[in-house]
């Protein structure tokens, strides 16, 4: 029986050109998390695997950074980044838990959940 629940950042908005942190939190289960996937519609953005660490999809490498924690940071946002994002927790023995976040990228507004980056 799957007892866990996923809490997400919900519906969020951010400014074009800015950054946003996507976060999900799995709770109320003792199941062991083995992998967390981040997906945008049907595209894989990133994976955090228990044995292999983080893998960022090559097409997103310049604009996606892992963390904080099991979250994901999207940088240099464009209007095309507007849409649904999913965190998929693979657990044993429960199975899969999925959380949904809707991101709206605005032409000009105050960015929420902004992240500060330093890229050498």
């Amino acid at each position: 029986m799957m007892t866990g629940t996923i809490e997400t950042t919900g519906n969020i908005s951010a400014e074009k050109g800015g950054s946003i942190i996507l976060q999900c939190h799995l709770s109320s289960t003792t199941a062991q998390v083995t992998q967390v996937n981040w997906e945008q519609q049907d595209q894989l953005l990133a994976i955090c695997n228990a044995d292999l660490g983080w893998h960022i999809s090559p097409s997103f490498k310049d604009r996606v950074a892992p963390g904080p924690g099991l979250g994901l940071t999207l940088q240099s946002l464009t209007v095309n980044d507007t849409g649904e994002y999913f965190c998929i927790y693979h657990t044993y023995p429960d199975g899969t838990y999925t959380g949904r976040i809707f991101l709206e990228v605005l032409e000009s507004s105050v960015a929420e959940h902004g992240a500060r980056f330093q890229i050498p």
């Epitope: 660490g53 983080w54 963390g67 924690g69 980056f117």
Partner: antibody, heavy 117, light 107 residues
């Protein structure tokens, strides 16, 4: 098996700089955050900052922004922390720690930095 | 920055006792809270991650609970090897922060 190897100690003069190292083995170095943590004698743990070797992205605690610089050498699987303008306040044990799916799951043994004339 | 406050600062107990250590966050960190044990002259060791997830190789007498701002590390039937320092840490947002620690000492 995963290992993070740090030199046991470093002795430096006040005003000088030092580059602490953390050599990683047993895992894919570029796929995990590497963090640096400071612990003064008998005190608590202070998070200095982190670096993602796969991209070079760094984050720092504001307190350490003008004190430490984090770098990596992916060819040798080694993380570095450069500390500048050293004072006695910088005397401490400095740990490197790996963060993956299970948070800070592996730590180095720590380098004891002594700043003394 | 998120401040983590641990209490009590020191706890004097007898082997065989059960104890609860508290960690309180200055704002909600959901379940991004981890517990570490540190013995004298050793590196910290991860005990519990994400508030309540058990770690391979850690005895089952260590249990974590809580969410949001209030978290607890419970240790049942204390053994002599359990004495030392305990720290909580949040990874909900950068900068990551640690609590000031609780010293568990033998009465």
């Amino acid at each position: 098996q995963v290992q993070l190897q740090q030199p046991g100690s470093e002795l430096v003069r006040p005003g000088a700089s030092v580059k602490l190292s953390c050599k990683a083995s047993g895992y894919t170095f570029t796929s995990y955050w590497m963090h640096w943590v400071k612990q003064r004698h008998g005190q608590g743990l202070e998070w200095i900052g982190n670096i993602f070797p796969g991209s070079g992205i760094t984050n720092y605690d504001e307190k350490f922004k003008n004190k430490g610089t984090l770098t990596v050498d992916t060819s040798s699987n080694t993380a570095y922390m450069h500390l500048s303008s050293l004072t006695s306040d910088d005397s401490a044990v400095y740990y490197c720690a790996r963060e993956g799916l299970y948070a800070f799951d592996y730590w180095g043994q720590g380098t004891t930095l002594t700043v003394s004339s | 920055d998120i401040v983590l406050t641990q209490s009590p600062a020191t706890l004097s107990v007898t082997p065989g006792d059960s104890v609860s250590l508290s960690c309180r966050a200055s704002q909600s960190i959901r379940n991004s809270l981890h517990w570490f044990q540190q013995k004298s002259l050793e590196s910290p060791r991860l005990l519990i991650n994400y508030a309540s997830q058990s770690i391979s190789g850690i005895p089952s007498r260590f249990r974590g609970s809580g969410s949001g701002t209030d978290f607890t590390l419970s240790i049942n039937n204390l053994e002599t090897e359990d004495f030392g320092m305990y720290f909580c840490q949040q990874t909900n947002s950068w900068p990551y922060t640690f609590g000031g620690g609780t010293k568990l000492e033998i009465k």
